[in-house]
Interface confidence: low
Protein backbone atom coordinates (compact mmCIF):
# COMPACT_ATOMS: atom_id res chain seq x y z
CA UNK A 1 0.00 0.00 0.00
CA UNK A 2 0.84 3.68 -0.01
CA UNK A 3 3.00 4.19 3.09
CA UNK A 4 4.16 7.74 2.40
CA UNK A 5 3.92 10.08 5.42
CA UNK A 6 0.84 12.33 5.47
CA UNK A 7 0.58 15.97 6.53
CA UNK A 8 -2.79 17.52 7.34
CA UNK A 9 -3.91 21.14 7.83
CA UNK A 10 -7.39 21.75 9.27
CA UNK A 11 -8.82 25.23 9.76
CA UNK A 12 -12.18 25.41 11.60
CA UNK A 13 -14.28 28.53 12.05
CA UNK A 14 -16.85 27.81 14.75
CA UNK A 15 -19.93 29.80 15.74
CA UNK A 16 -21.53 28.80 19.04
CA UNK A 17 -25.02 30.18 19.64
CA UNK A 18 -26.73 30.58 23.02
CA UNK A 19 -30.40 31.55 23.32
CA UNK A 20 -30.82 32.17 19.60
CA UNK A 21 -28.27 34.80 18.65
CA UNK A 22 -28.41 36.61 21.99
CA UNK A 23 -24.96 35.33 22.96
CA UNK A 24 -22.50 34.21 20.29
CA UNK A 25 -18.98 32.86 20.62
CA UNK A 26 -16.69 32.79 17.58
CA UNK A 27 -13.64 30.52 17.38
CA UNK A 28 -11.13 30.62 14.54
CA UNK A 29 -9.00 27.49 15.02
CA UNK A 30 -6.11 25.93 13.13
CA UNK A 31 -4.91 22.33 13.44
CA UNK A 32 -1.74 20.77 12.17
CA UNK A 33 -2.25 17.04 11.91
CA UNK A 34 -4.55 16.44 14.90
CA UNK A 35 -3.15 19.16 17.12
CA UNK A 36 -4.48 22.70 17.53
CA UNK A 37 -1.67 25.23 16.97
CA UNK A 38 -3.37 28.64 17.12
CA UNK A 39 -6.83 30.09 17.75
CA UNK A 40 -8.87 33.26 17.97
CA UNK A 41 -11.58 33.17 20.65
CA UNK A 42 -14.10 36.03 20.66
CA UNK A 43 -14.27 35.66 24.47
CA UNK A 44 -10.53 36.47 24.56
CA UNK A 45 -10.38 39.00 21.72
CA UNK A 46 -7.00 38.09 20.24
CA UNK A 47 -5.13 35.20 18.64
CA UNK A 48 -3.37 32.83 21.04
CA UNK A 49 -0.83 30.11 20.35
CA UNK A 50 -2.10 26.71 21.57
CA UNK A 51 1.23 24.98 20.91
CA UNK A 52 4.70 26.37 20.16
CA UNK A 53 4.05 25.54 16.51
CA UNK A 54 1.41 28.27 16.36
CA UNK A 55 3.31 31.04 18.14
CA UNK A 56 4.61 32.78 14.97
CA UNK A 57 1.06 32.94 13.56
CA UNK A 58 -0.50 34.33 16.76
CA UNK A 59 2.15 37.04 16.97
CA UNK A 60 1.85 37.97 13.32
CA UNK A 61 -1.98 38.03 13.15
CA UNK A 62 -2.25 40.07 16.35
CA UNK A 63 0.13 42.63 14.80
CA UNK A 64 -2.14 43.03 11.76
CA UNK A 65 -4.86 45.54 12.72
CA UNK A 66 -7.24 44.58 9.88
CA UNK A 67 -6.99 40.81 10.60
CA UNK A 68 -7.67 41.38 14.31
CA UNK A 69 -10.61 43.72 13.65
CA UNK A 70 -12.12 41.27 11.19
CA UNK A 71 -11.84 38.47 13.74
CA UNK A 72 -13.42 40.62 16.49
CA UNK A 73 -16.33 41.59 14.21
CA UNK A 74 -16.95 37.99 13.13
CA UNK A 75 -19.60 37.30 15.82
CA UNK A 76 -21.79 39.71 13.83
CA UNK A 77 -20.48 39.76 10.28
CA UNK A 78 -19.96 36.00 10.08
CA UNK A 79 -21.83 34.14 12.84
CA UNK A 80 -25.06 36.11 13.25
CA UNK A 81 -25.14 36.65 9.50
CA UNK A 82 -24.90 32.92 8.70
CA UNK A 83 -27.39 32.03 11.44
CA UNK A 84 -29.93 34.36 9.82
CA UNK A 85 -29.31 32.95 6.34
CA UNK A 86 -29.70 29.34 7.43
CA UNK A 87 -32.19 29.62 10.28
CA UNK A 88 -35.31 28.59 8.33
CA UNK A 89 -33.89 25.25 7.20
CA UNK A 90 -31.57 24.43 10.10
CA UNK A 91 -32.66 25.88 13.45
CA UNK A 92 -36.33 25.69 12.52
CA UNK A 93 -36.17 22.29 10.79
CA UNK A 94 -38.68 19.84 12.25
CA UNK A 95 -39.24 16.28 11.11
CA UNK A 96 -41.67 14.11 13.05
CA UNK A 97 -40.46 10.72 14.26
CA UNK A 98 -41.89 7.47 13.00
CA UNK A 99 -42.51 5.29 16.05
CA UNK A 100 -42.72 1.50 15.91
CA UNK A 101 -42.97 -1.01 18.76
CA UNK A 102 -42.07 -4.67 18.45
CA UNK A 103 -40.68 -7.50 20.60
CA UNK A 104 -37.06 -8.24 19.77
CA UNK A 105 -37.82 -11.93 19.46
CA UNK A 106 -40.87 -14.12 19.04
CA UNK A 107 -41.52 -15.50 22.50
CA UNK A 108 -44.56 -16.97 24.20
CA UNK A 109 -46.06 -14.94 27.04
CA UNK A 110 -44.38 -15.04 30.45
CA UNK A 111 -40.95 -15.44 28.88
CA UNK A 112 -38.21 -12.85 29.17
CA UNK A 113 -38.23 -10.50 26.19
CA UNK A 114 -37.05 -7.10 25.06
CA UNK A 115 -39.73 -4.74 23.82
CA UNK A 116 -38.22 -2.38 21.28
CA UNK A 117 -39.46 1.14 20.68
CA UNK A 118 -37.91 2.28 17.43
CA UNK A 119 -38.02 6.02 16.88
CA UNK A 120 -36.66 6.98 13.48
CA UNK A 121 -36.40 9.72 10.90
CA UNK A 122 -36.71 12.68 13.26
CA UNK A 123 -35.05 16.08 13.50
CA UNK A 124 -33.75 17.77 15.62
CA UNK A 125 -32.06 15.22 17.87
CA UNK A 126 -33.58 16.31 21.18
CA UNK A 127 -36.10 13.62 22.12
CA UNK A 128 -37.65 11.95 25.19
CA UNK A 129 -38.70 8.31 25.01
CA UNK A 130 -40.55 6.70 27.92
CA UNK A 131 -42.06 3.28 28.53
CA UNK A 132 -45.33 2.73 30.39
CA UNK A 133 -46.89 -0.49 31.59
CA UNK A 134 -50.65 -0.24 32.10
CA UNK A 135 -50.28 3.53 32.43
CA UNK A 136 -47.41 3.47 34.95
CA UNK A 137 -43.99 4.66 33.84
CA UNK A 138 -41.31 1.97 33.77
CA UNK A 139 -37.92 3.33 34.77
CA UNK A 140 -36.02 0.12 35.44
CA UNK A 141 -34.88 -2.31 32.77
CA UNK A 142 -34.54 0.29 30.03
CA UNK A 143 -31.68 0.04 27.55
CA UNK A 144 -31.06 2.57 24.79
CA UNK A 145 -28.82 2.84 21.77
CA UNK A 146 -28.61 6.53 22.52
CA UNK A 147 -29.10 9.10 19.80
CA UNK A 148 -27.91 7.96 16.38
CA UNK A 149 -27.20 10.56 13.70
CA UNK A 150 -27.91 9.15 10.24
CA UNK A 151 -25.87 11.77 8.39
CA UNK A 152 -28.85 12.89 6.31
CA UNK A 153 -30.43 15.40 8.71
CA UNK A 154 -32.38 12.70 10.51
CA UNK A 155 -31.82 10.82 13.75
CA UNK A 156 -32.95 7.52 15.15
CA UNK A 157 -32.91 5.79 18.50
CA UNK A 158 -33.98 2.44 19.91
CA UNK A 159 -35.22 2.27 23.48
CA UNK A 160 -35.63 -1.28 24.78
CA UNK A 161 -37.59 -2.43 27.80
CA UNK A 162 -36.65 -5.69 29.48
CA UNK A 163 -39.89 -7.37 30.40
CA UNK A 164 -41.80 -10.58 30.92
CA UNK A 165 -45.08 -9.87 29.11
CA UNK A 166 -48.27 -11.22 30.66
CA UNK A 167 -51.63 -11.55 28.98
CA UNK A 168 -53.71 -8.39 29.07
CA UNK A 169 -50.79 -6.06 29.76
CA UNK A 170 -50.57 -2.89 27.72
CA UNK A 171 -47.11 -1.48 27.08
CA UNK A 172 -46.92 2.08 25.75
CA UNK A 173 -43.95 3.84 24.23
CA UNK A 174 -44.32 7.60 24.60
CA UNK A 175 -42.25 10.00 22.54
CA UNK A 176 -41.89 13.72 23.10
CA UNK A 177 -40.24 15.74 20.34
CA UNK A 178 -40.15 19.40 19.24
CA UNK A 179 -42.01 18.48 16.02
CA UNK A 180 -45.18 17.57 17.92
CA UNK A 181 -47.21 19.55 20.43
CA UNK A 182 -48.42 16.48 22.32
CA UNK A 183 -46.58 13.19 22.92
CA UNK A 184 -46.77 10.41 20.34
CA UNK A 185 -47.83 7.10 21.84
CA UNK A 186 -47.69 3.58 20.47
CA UNK A 187 -49.20 0.65 22.35
CA UNK A 188 -48.20 -2.99 22.40
CA UNK A 189 -50.61 -5.46 23.92
CA UNK A 190 -49.45 -8.76 25.32
CA UNK A 191 -51.54 -11.39 23.59
CA UNK A 192 -51.22 -15.13 23.19
CA UNK A 193 -50.98 -14.97 19.36
CA UNK A 194 -47.48 -14.51 18.02
CA UNK A 195 -48.36 -12.09 15.22
CA UNK A 196 -49.70 -8.81 16.54
CA UNK A 197 -50.68 -5.86 14.47
CA UNK A 198 -53.21 -3.06 14.55
CA UNK B 1 -24.11 26.73 29.82
CA UNK B 2 -24.27 24.43 26.78
CA UNK B 3 -24.76 26.14 23.46
CA UNK B 4 -27.99 25.57 21.54
CA UNK B 5 -26.43 25.40 18.10
CA UNK B 6 -22.99 25.26 16.48
CA UNK B 7 -22.13 26.17 12.90
CA UNK B 8 -18.67 25.13 11.73
CA UNK B 9 -16.87 26.03 8.54
CA UNK B 10 -14.50 23.06 8.31
CA UNK B 11 -11.69 22.78 5.81
CA UNK B 12 -8.69 20.56 5.29
CA UNK B 13 -5.78 20.10 2.98
CA UNK B 14 -3.83 16.83 2.88
CA UNK B 15 -0.37 16.18 1.42
CA UNK B 16 0.98 14.41 -0.54
CA UNK B 17 -2.50 13.41 -1.75
CA UNK B 18 -3.24 17.07 -2.58
CA UNK B 19 -6.84 16.55 -1.50
CA UNK B 20 -8.87 19.35 0.04
CA UNK B 21 -12.33 19.88 1.42
CA UNK B 22 -14.50 22.86 2.31
CA UNK B 23 -17.83 22.31 4.07
CA UNK B 24 -20.30 23.86 6.50
CA UNK B 25 -21.61 21.83 9.43
CA UNK B 26 -24.70 22.56 11.56
CA UNK B 27 -24.97 20.60 14.82
CA UNK B 28 -23.08 17.71 13.25
CA UNK B 29 -24.94 17.62 9.92
CA UNK B 30 -23.48 18.87 6.65
CA UNK B 31 -25.20 21.91 5.17
CA UNK B 32 -23.10 21.87 2.01
CA UNK B 33 -19.64 21.21 0.65
CA UNK B 34 -17.84 22.56 -2.38
CA UNK B 35 -16.94 20.12 -5.14
CA UNK B 36 -13.37 21.16 -5.93
CA UNK B 37 -13.29 19.50 -9.35
CA UNK B 38 -16.59 20.93 -10.55
CA UNK B 39 -16.10 24.20 -8.65
CA UNK B 40 -19.68 24.16 -7.41
CA UNK B 41 -21.65 24.17 -4.17
CA UNK B 42 -23.29 20.82 -3.35
CA UNK B 43 -26.16 21.10 -0.83
CA UNK B 44 -26.58 18.11 1.47
CA UNK B 45 -30.35 18.28 1.03
CA UNK B 46 -31.53 19.61 -2.29
CA UNK B 47 -34.07 21.97 -0.71
CA UNK B 48 -31.33 23.90 1.12
CA UNK B 49 -30.28 25.41 -2.19
CA UNK B 50 -33.70 27.02 -2.48
CA UNK B 51 -33.14 29.00 0.72
CA UNK B 52 -29.50 30.03 0.47
CA UNK B 53 -26.56 30.37 -1.87
CA UNK B 54 -22.81 30.05 -1.50
CA UNK B 55 -20.18 31.25 -3.94
CA UNK B 56 -17.94 28.21 -4.56
CA UNK B 57 -15.08 30.39 -5.78
CA UNK B 58 -14.49 31.61 -2.21
CA UNK B 59 -13.88 28.06 -1.05
CA UNK B 60 -11.35 27.46 -3.81
CA UNK B 61 -9.44 30.56 -2.66
CA UNK B 62 -9.47 29.22 0.94
CA UNK B 63 -8.13 25.85 -0.18
CA UNK B 64 -5.27 27.58 -2.01
CA UNK B 65 -4.36 29.39 1.24
CA UNK B 66 -4.69 26.10 3.17
CA UNK B 67 -2.26 24.42 0.77
CA UNK B 68 0.31 27.19 1.32
CA UNK B 69 -0.19 27.11 5.11
CA UNK B 70 0.22 23.34 5.21
CA UNK B 71 3.59 23.61 3.49
CA UNK B 72 4.69 26.26 6.00
CA UNK B 73 3.52 24.15 8.97
CA UNK B 74 5.07 20.96 7.59
CA UNK B 75 8.49 22.66 7.42
CA UNK B 76 7.99 24.35 10.79
CA UNK B 77 7.20 20.97 12.39
CA UNK B 78 10.36 19.50 10.92
CA UNK B 79 8.23 17.26 8.69
CA UNK B 80 6.31 15.58 11.50
CA UNK B 81 3.71 13.30 9.83
CA UNK B 82 0.21 12.61 11.10
CA UNK B 83 -0.35 9.47 13.16
CA UNK B 84 -2.88 7.15 11.53
CA UNK B 85 -5.99 6.62 13.66
CA UNK B 86 -8.06 3.66 12.40
CA UNK B 87 -11.82 4.01 12.03
CA UNK B 88 -14.58 2.44 14.05
CA UNK B 89 -17.22 1.07 11.68
CA UNK B 90 -20.91 0.45 12.36
CA UNK B 91 -23.56 -0.84 9.97
CA UNK B 92 -27.19 -0.07 10.71
CA UNK B 93 -30.44 0.49 8.87
CA UNK B 94 -32.26 3.76 8.38
CA UNK B 95 -35.50 2.42 9.89
CA UNK B 96 -36.96 -0.84 11.29
CA UNK B 97 -36.52 -3.67 8.83
CA UNK B 98 -39.47 -5.30 7.13
CA UNK B 99 -38.94 -7.98 4.51
CA UNK B 100 -39.20 -6.63 0.95
CA UNK B 101 -39.89 -3.11 2.21
CA UNK B 102 -37.32 -0.63 0.84
CA UNK B 103 -34.77 0.48 3.40
CA UNK B 104 -31.26 1.92 3.50
CA UNK B 105 -28.13 0.39 4.97
CA UNK B 106 -25.87 2.96 6.61
CA UNK B 107 -22.16 2.37 7.04
CA UNK B 108 -20.92 4.80 9.67
CA UNK B 109 -17.16 5.25 9.63
CA UNK B 110 -16.01 7.18 12.68
CA UNK B 111 -13.01 8.49 14.66
CA UNK B 112 -10.30 8.25 12.02
CA UNK B 113 -7.58 10.34 10.42
CA UNK B 114 -6.18 11.16 7.91
CA UNK B 115 -9.34 11.72 5.84
CA UNK B 116 -8.78 9.02 3.24
CA UNK B 117 -10.84 5.82 3.17
CA UNK B 118 -11.81 3.23 0.59
CA UNK B 119 -15.33 1.91 1.19
CA UNK B 120 -17.05 -0.93 -0.66
CA UNK B 121 -20.51 -2.40 -0.19
CA UNK B 122 -20.74 -6.17 -0.63
CA UNK B 123 -23.95 -8.12 -1.24
CA UNK B 124 -23.40 -11.84 -0.75
CA UNK B 125 -19.69 -11.11 -1.05
CA UNK B 126 -19.90 -9.22 -4.35
CA UNK B 127 -19.34 -5.46 -4.71
CA UNK B 128 -22.50 -3.37 -5.19
CA UNK B 129 -22.45 0.07 -6.76
CA UNK B 130 -26.07 0.65 -7.82
CA UNK B 131 -27.74 3.39 -5.82
CA UNK B 132 -24.88 3.89 -3.36
CA UNK B 133 -24.09 7.33 -2.00
CA UNK B 134 -21.77 8.87 0.55
CA UNK B 135 -21.07 12.01 2.52
CA UNK B 136 -17.86 14.00 2.46
CA UNK B 137 -15.54 13.79 5.47
CA UNK B 138 -17.33 15.33 8.44
CA UNK B 139 -15.49 17.03 11.31
CA UNK B 140 -15.50 15.80 14.89
CA UNK B 141 -14.90 17.73 18.10
CA UNK B 142 -11.68 15.74 18.67
CA UNK B 143 -10.59 16.76 15.12
CA UNK B 144 -10.81 13.24 13.79
CA UNK B 145 -13.32 12.53 11.01
CA UNK B 146 -16.65 10.82 10.38
CA UNK B 147 -18.17 9.61 7.13
CA UNK B 148 -21.42 7.94 6.05
CA UNK B 149 -21.96 5.55 3.15
CA UNK B 150 -25.47 4.51 2.11
CA UNK B 151 -26.89 1.51 0.26
CA UNK B 152 -30.61 1.41 -0.60
CA UNK B 153 -31.79 -2.20 -0.46
CA UNK B 154 -34.75 -4.56 -0.20
CA UNK B 155 -34.38 -6.68 2.93
CA UNK B 156 -34.66 -10.38 2.23
CA UNK B 157 -33.76 -13.56 4.10
CA UNK B 158 -31.41 -14.59 1.29
CA UNK B 159 -29.09 -11.59 1.08
CA UNK B 160 -26.24 -10.70 3.42
CA UNK B 161 -24.33 -7.43 3.32
CA UNK B 162 -20.92 -6.17 4.35
CA UNK B 163 -19.40 -2.72 4.48
CA UNK B 164 -15.71 -3.09 3.68
CA UNK B 165 -13.44 -0.26 4.88
CA UNK B 166 -9.78 0.24 4.06
CA UNK B 167 -7.70 2.82 5.93
CA UNK B 168 -3.97 3.29 6.54
CA UNK B 169 -4.55 2.80 10.25
CA UNK B 170 -5.93 -0.72 9.65
CA UNK B 171 -3.66 -3.73 9.14
CA UNK B 172 -6.30 -5.30 6.90
CA UNK B 173 -9.68 -4.26 5.47
CA UNK B 174 -12.40 -4.07 8.11
CA UNK B 175 -15.67 -5.80 7.23
CA UNK B 176 -18.88 -5.03 9.11
CA UNK B 177 -21.68 -7.49 8.47
CA UNK B 178 -25.44 -7.09 8.29
CA UNK B 179 -28.14 -9.63 7.69
CA UNK B 180 -31.88 -9.90 8.26
CA UNK B 181 -32.66 -10.92 11.80
CA UNK B 182 -35.14 -13.67 12.67
CA UNK B 183 -38.66 -12.28 12.20
CA UNK B 184 -40.54 -10.68 15.06
CA UNK B 185 -44.30 -10.24 15.23
CA UNK B 186 -45.66 -7.35 13.20
CA UNK B 187 -45.04 -3.93 14.74
CA UNK B 188 -47.75 -2.08 16.62
CA UNK B 189 -48.96 1.41 15.84
CA UNK B 190 -51.80 3.15 17.57
CA UNK B 191 -53.88 6.30 17.36
Amino acid sequence: GDTRPRFLWQPKRECHFFNGTERVRFLDRYFYNQEESVRFDSDVGEFRAVTELGRPDAEYWNSQKDILEQARAAVDTYCRHNYGVGESFTVQRRVQPKVTVYPSKTQPLQHHNLLVCSVSGFYPGSIEVRWFLNGQEEKAGMVSTGLIQNGDWTFQTLVMLETVPRSGEVYTCQVEHPSVTSPLTVEWRARSESAQSK
Amino acid sequence: IKEEHVIIQAEFYLNPDQSGEFMFDFDGDEIFHVDMAKKETVWRLEEFGRFASFEAQGALANIAVDKANLEIMTKRSNYTPITNVPPEVTVLTNSPVELREPNVLICFIDKFTPPVVNVTWLRNGKPVTTGVSETVFLPREDHLFRKFHYLPFLPSTEDVYDCRVEHWGLDEPLLKHWEFDAPSPLPETTE
Partner: antibody, heavy 120, light 109 residues
Amino acid sequence: QVQLKESGPALVKPTQTLTLTCTFSGFSLSTSGVGVGWIRQPPGKALEWLALIDWDDDKYYSTSLKTRLTISKDTSKNQVVLTMTNMDPVDTATYYCARSPRYRGAFDYWGQGTLVTVSS
Amino acid sequence: DIVLTQPPSVSGAPGQRVTISCSGSESNIGNNYVQWYQQLPGTAPKLLIYDNNQRPSGVPDRFSGSKSGTSASLAITGLQSEDEADYYCQSYDMNVHVFGGGTKLTVLG
Protein backbone atom coordinates in the same frame (compact mmCIF):
# COMPACT_ATOMS: atom_id res chain seq x y z
CA GLN C 1 -64.96 4.07 16.67
CA VAL C 2 -63.37 5.21 13.44
CA GLN C 3 -65.70 6.97 11.01
CA LEU C 4 -65.16 9.00 7.84
CA LYS C 5 -67.69 10.97 5.82
CA GLU C 6 -67.31 12.71 2.48
CA SER C 7 -69.16 15.90 1.64
CA GLY C 8 -69.28 18.14 -1.41
CA PRO C 9 -71.43 19.02 -4.40
CA ALA C 10 -73.38 16.27 -6.14
CA LEU C 11 -73.25 18.14 -9.45
CA VAL C 12 -70.47 20.22 -11.00
CA LYS C 13 -70.17 21.76 -14.44
CA PRO C 14 -67.32 20.96 -16.83
CA THR C 15 -64.18 23.12 -16.30
CA GLN C 16 -65.25 23.90 -12.72
CA THR C 17 -63.20 23.00 -9.63
CA LEU C 18 -64.47 20.28 -7.30
CA THR C 19 -63.87 20.65 -3.58
CA LEU C 20 -64.52 17.61 -1.38
CA THR C 21 -64.21 17.46 2.40
CA CYS C 22 -63.56 14.33 4.44
CA THR C 23 -64.62 14.72 8.06
CA PHE C 24 -63.43 11.95 10.36
CA SER C 25 -63.63 10.87 13.98
CA GLY C 26 -62.14 8.14 16.16
CA PHE C 27 -58.54 8.90 15.23
CA SER C 28 -56.18 11.83 14.89
CA LEU C 29 -54.23 12.85 11.80
CA SER C 30 -51.43 14.05 14.05
CA THR C 31 -50.69 10.48 15.16
CA SER C 32 -47.42 9.19 13.77
CA GLY C 33 -48.00 6.96 10.75
CA VAL C 34 -51.60 7.90 10.02
CA GLY C 35 -52.71 9.09 6.58
CA VAL C 36 -55.97 9.90 4.84
CA GLY C 37 -56.43 9.17 1.16
CA TRP C 38 -58.95 9.76 -1.59
CA ILE C 39 -60.09 7.05 -4.01
CA ARG C 40 -62.71 7.34 -6.72
CA GLN C 41 -64.82 4.90 -8.69
CA PRO C 42 -66.61 5.79 -11.94
CA PRO C 43 -69.97 3.99 -12.32
CA GLY C 44 -69.39 0.31 -13.11
CA LYS C 45 -65.61 0.75 -13.15
CA ALA C 46 -62.57 0.08 -10.97
CA LEU C 47 -61.23 1.94 -7.94
CA GLU C 48 -58.68 4.64 -8.74
CA TRP C 49 -56.38 6.10 -6.07
CA LEU C 50 -56.13 9.89 -6.21
CA ALA C 51 -54.16 11.33 -3.32
CA LEU C 52 -53.01 10.85 0.26
CA ILE C 53 -51.84 13.16 3.04
CA ASP C 54 -49.68 11.94 5.93
CA TRP C 55 -49.63 12.88 9.60
CA ASP C 56 -46.51 14.95 8.94
CA ASP C 57 -48.13 16.79 6.00
CA ASP C 58 -46.35 14.84 3.27
CA LYS C 59 -48.62 14.75 0.21
CA TYR C 60 -48.78 12.09 -2.50
CA TYR C 61 -50.72 12.29 -5.77
CA SER C 62 -51.76 10.03 -8.61
CA THR C 63 -49.18 10.42 -11.36
CA SER C 64 -51.78 10.97 -14.08
CA LEU C 65 -53.83 13.52 -12.09
CA LYS C 66 -51.27 15.36 -9.97
CA THR C 67 -51.47 18.60 -11.96
CA ARG C 68 -55.19 18.84 -11.12
CA LEU C 69 -55.19 17.71 -7.49
CA THR C 70 -54.47 19.43 -4.17
CA ILE C 71 -54.85 17.71 -0.81
CA SER C 72 -54.70 19.49 2.53
CA LYS C 73 -55.60 18.86 6.16
CA ASP C 74 -56.98 20.72 9.13
CA THR C 75 -55.90 18.56 12.06
CA SER C 76 -57.87 20.60 14.61
CA LYS C 77 -61.12 20.14 12.67
CA ASN C 78 -60.39 16.48 11.80
CA GLN C 79 -60.82 17.27 8.13
CA VAL C 80 -59.02 16.55 4.87
CA VAL C 81 -59.88 18.53 1.77
CA LEU C 82 -59.33 17.48 -1.84
CA THR C 83 -59.65 19.92 -4.73
CA MET C 84 -59.73 18.83 -8.34
CA THR C 85 -59.54 21.45 -11.07
CA ASN C 86 -60.89 21.48 -14.62
CA MET C 87 -63.59 18.86 -14.10
CA ASP C 88 -64.75 16.81 -17.07
CA PRO C 89 -67.68 14.37 -17.55
CA VAL C 90 -65.17 11.48 -17.33
CA ASP C 91 -64.55 12.55 -13.72
CA THR C 92 -68.09 11.49 -12.82
CA ALA C 93 -67.57 8.98 -10.02
CA THR C 94 -68.19 8.07 -6.41
CA TYR C 95 -65.42 9.69 -4.38
CA TYR C 96 -64.31 7.92 -1.19
CA CYS C 97 -61.98 9.02 1.58
CA ALA C 98 -60.22 6.36 3.62
CA ARG C 99 -57.81 6.06 6.51
CA SER C 100 -54.37 4.49 6.38
CA PRO C 101 -53.40 3.61 9.98
CA ARG C 102 -49.67 3.49 9.42
CA TYR C 103 -47.10 4.73 6.97
CA ARG C 104 -47.59 2.98 3.61
CA GLY C 105 -50.38 0.95 5.20
CA ALA C 106 -53.69 -0.38 3.93
CA PHE C 107 -56.93 1.63 3.86
CA ASP C 108 -58.64 0.06 6.84
CA TYR C 109 -61.66 2.37 7.18
CA TRP C 110 -63.60 3.97 4.34
CA GLY C 111 -66.29 6.61 4.10
CA GLN C 112 -69.62 5.76 2.48
CA GLY C 113 -68.64 7.72 -0.64
CA THR C 114 -70.24 10.68 -2.39
CA LEU C 115 -71.40 10.59 -6.01
CA VAL C 116 -70.19 13.54 -8.06
CA THR C 117 -71.73 14.03 -11.50
CA VAL C 118 -70.03 16.31 -14.02
CA SER C 119 -72.52 17.65 -16.49
CA SER C 120 -73.51 20.93 -18.07
CA ASP D 1 -54.11 4.15 -15.05
CA ILE D 2 -54.43 0.57 -13.79
CA VAL D 3 -51.03 -0.88 -12.95
CA LEU D 4 -52.04 -4.18 -11.32
CA THR D 5 -53.70 -6.81 -13.50
CA GLN D 6 -56.62 -8.92 -12.26
CA PRO D 7 -58.95 -11.27 -14.17
CA PRO D 8 -62.24 -9.48 -14.89
CA SER D 9 -64.31 -12.32 -13.43
CA VAL D 10 -64.15 -15.63 -11.62
CA SER D 11 -66.92 -17.94 -10.49
CA GLY D 12 -67.47 -20.93 -8.28
CA ALA D 13 -70.19 -23.01 -6.69
CA PRO D 14 -71.01 -22.74 -2.97
CA GLY D 15 -68.48 -24.64 -0.85
CA GLN D 16 -65.79 -24.49 -3.53
CA ARG D 17 -62.41 -22.79 -3.43
CA VAL D 18 -61.60 -19.91 -5.78
CA THR D 19 -58.48 -17.81 -6.26
CA ILE D 20 -58.09 -14.33 -7.70
CA SER D 21 -54.71 -13.34 -9.08
CA CYS D 22 -53.07 -9.92 -9.10
CA SER D 23 -50.03 -9.35 -11.28
CA GLY D 24 -47.68 -6.40 -11.01
CA SER D 25 -44.01 -5.60 -11.36
CA GLU D 26 -40.85 -5.37 -9.25
CA SER D 27 -41.48 -1.68 -8.48
CA ASN D 28 -44.90 -2.31 -6.95
CA ILE D 29 -45.82 -5.81 -5.75
CA GLY D 30 -42.20 -6.97 -5.92
CA ASN D 31 -41.06 -4.34 -3.43
CA ASN D 32 -44.17 -3.71 -1.35
CA TYR D 33 -47.05 -5.18 0.58
CA VAL D 34 -50.32 -6.12 -1.12
CA GLN D 35 -53.82 -5.43 0.19
CA TRP D 36 -57.16 -6.92 -0.88
CA TYR D 37 -60.56 -5.21 -0.65
CA GLN D 38 -64.07 -6.59 -1.00
CA GLN D 39 -66.80 -4.38 -2.41
CA LEU D 40 -70.35 -5.65 -2.05
CA PRO D 41 -72.87 -4.16 -4.51
CA GLY D 42 -73.75 -0.56 -3.66
CA THR D 43 -71.34 -0.29 -0.72
CA ALA D 44 -67.89 1.11 0.00
CA PRO D 45 -64.87 -1.20 -0.24
CA LYS D 46 -63.89 -3.14 2.88
CA LEU D 47 -60.35 -4.20 3.82
CA LEU D 48 -60.06 -7.97 3.56
CA ILE D 49 -56.30 -8.68 3.63
CA TYR D 50 -53.35 -6.39 4.44
CA ASP D 51 -49.58 -6.85 4.40
CA ASN D 52 -49.89 -9.71 1.88
CA ASN D 53 -51.51 -12.23 4.21
CA GLN D 54 -52.85 -10.57 7.36
CA ARG D 55 -56.59 -10.60 8.14
CA PRO D 56 -58.20 -7.72 10.04
CA SER D 57 -60.33 -8.81 12.98
CA GLY D 58 -63.79 -9.87 11.85
CA VAL D 59 -62.67 -11.25 8.48
CA PRO D 60 -63.36 -15.01 8.32
CA ASP D 61 -60.36 -17.30 7.92
CA ARG D 62 -61.92 -18.58 4.67
CA PHE D 63 -60.12 -15.59 3.12
CA SER D 64 -56.34 -15.79 2.75
CA GLY D 65 -53.71 -13.85 0.86
CA SER D 66 -50.29 -14.73 -0.46
CA LYS D 67 -47.53 -13.12 -2.49
CA SER D 68 -44.73 -14.49 -4.62
CA GLY D 69 -42.34 -12.28 -6.53
CA THR D 70 -44.37 -9.77 -8.52
CA SER D 71 -47.74 -11.52 -8.14
CA ALA D 72 -50.26 -11.92 -5.35
CA SER D 73 -53.39 -13.96 -4.94
CA LEU D 74 -56.51 -14.05 -2.82
CA ALA D 75 -57.99 -17.44 -1.99
CA ILE D 76 -61.54 -17.98 -0.75
CA THR D 77 -62.47 -21.42 0.54
CA GLY D 78 -65.96 -22.71 1.41
CA LEU D 79 -67.53 -20.21 -0.99
CA GLN D 80 -70.77 -18.65 0.24
CA SER D 81 -73.44 -16.67 -1.61
CA GLU D 82 -72.60 -13.52 0.42
CA ASP D 83 -69.07 -13.62 -1.03
CA GLU D 84 -70.47 -12.46 -4.39
CA ALA D 85 -68.78 -9.08 -4.81
CA ASP D 86 -66.00 -7.18 -6.56
CA TYR D 87 -62.47 -7.79 -5.25
CA TYR D 88 -59.56 -5.36 -5.68
CA CYS D 89 -55.86 -5.76 -5.00
CA GLN D 90 -53.75 -2.74 -4.04
CA SER D 91 -50.05 -2.03 -3.55
CA TYR D 92 -47.65 0.94 -3.90
CA ASP D 93 -45.37 2.06 -6.66
CA MET D 94 -42.85 4.78 -5.73
CA ASN D 95 -45.08 6.36 -3.04
CA VAL D 96 -48.14 6.12 -5.29
CA HIS D 97 -50.92 3.73 -4.27
CA VAL D 98 -52.05 1.51 -7.14
CA PHE D 99 -55.19 -0.63 -7.49
CA GLY D 100 -55.99 -3.56 -9.71
CA GLY D 101 -58.83 -3.42 -12.23
CA GLY D 102 -61.09 -5.49 -9.98
CA THR D 103 -62.47 -9.01 -10.27
CA LYS D 104 -66.18 -9.83 -10.14
CA LEU D 105 -66.79 -13.02 -8.17
CA THR D 106 -70.01 -14.83 -9.06
CA VAL D 107 -71.29 -17.57 -6.78
CA LEU D 108 -73.11 -20.07 -8.99
CA GLY D 109 -76.37 -21.83 -8.28
